[in-house]
Amino acid sequence: ITQQDLAPQQRAAPQQKRSSPSEGLCPPGHHISEDGRDCISCKYGQDYSTHWNDLLFCLRCTRCDSGEVELSPCTTTRNTVCQCEEGTFREEDSPEMCRKCRTGCPRGMVKVGDCTPWSDIECVHKESGTKHSGEVPAVEETVTSSPGTPASPCS
């Protein structure tokens, strides 16, 4: 996922909706003006804010990387939701990029979990049933994984 730099937006165009802050905060879909007197709406498809805030600018929408699919577009109150393409996954410990799922399990192991957008295939030892968490072995059995069905997005 490419998160663009957060940068102040240009001065609010006349067509942007304005309202008054509540307890010094502006509602989702808005940011506060420099003088703190107005709430200025975010620009649809360009930037957003998800909670009550005193942001001086809305946050720029994420653009999905190549290798990702857009599950839902950016709105004024929600950032873009991106997900790894079929056959690839993004681990929570390495959120920077989608990695290819393994095509099969090492010898002596069986597949118990499919490739999903957020996890590689899961392999366990045939005898003990313990999980395998090592590097992809040089020799793999011809146990193929089916693409995981998209469910919840990677974020």
Partner: nanobody, 125 residues
Framework: EVQLLESGGGKVQPGGSLRLSCAAS????????MSWFRQAPGKGLEFVSA????????YYADSVKGRFTISRDNSKNTLYLQMNSLRAEDTAVYYC??????????????????WGQGTLVTVSS
């Protein structure tokens, strides 16, 4: 590796105030979004507030709007949460969170983030 240490929790009467601190070590926090979450007894994690990495402003959950104020001191590598007009429903363990990579405010408990051990806040008469 980032270590986060929360402090400032304790027992307070309804209507009272507390100031939580989160001291970070292992990385400068100045370029990172940071957040507070809380977990009430028997409940799930709830987003409380977040600070944008470049001090462009802050996010607040509906439940704390107007009562809590998040701030940070980048020179001290510390995040704060000033909690006023405390209510019984604010009783929870409060956690400080920092993202592994520079990004927008963390408002979801999912994802690769660093978490502190938490500090308990009890609001009771």
């Amino acid at each position: 590796e980032v270590q986060l240490l929360e402090s400032g929790g304790g027992k307070v009467q309804p209507g009272g105030s507390l100031r939580l601190s989160c001291a970070a070590s292992g990385r400068s926090i100045s370029n990172y979004a940071m957040s507070w979450f809380r977990q009430a007894p028997g409940k799930g994690l709830e987003f409380v507030s977040a600070s944008v990495w470049n001090n462009g402003g802050n996010y607040y959950a509906d439940s704390v709007k107007g009562r809590f104020t998040i701030s940070r001191d980048n020179s001290k590598n510390t995040l704060y949460l000033q909690m006023n007009s405390l209510r019984a429903e604010d009783t929870a363990v409060y956690y400080c969170v920092v993202a592994r990579t520079p990004e927008t405010p963390i408002t979801s408990a999912r994802g690769a983030n660093y978490w502190g051990q938490g500090t308990l806040v009890t609001v009771s008469s």
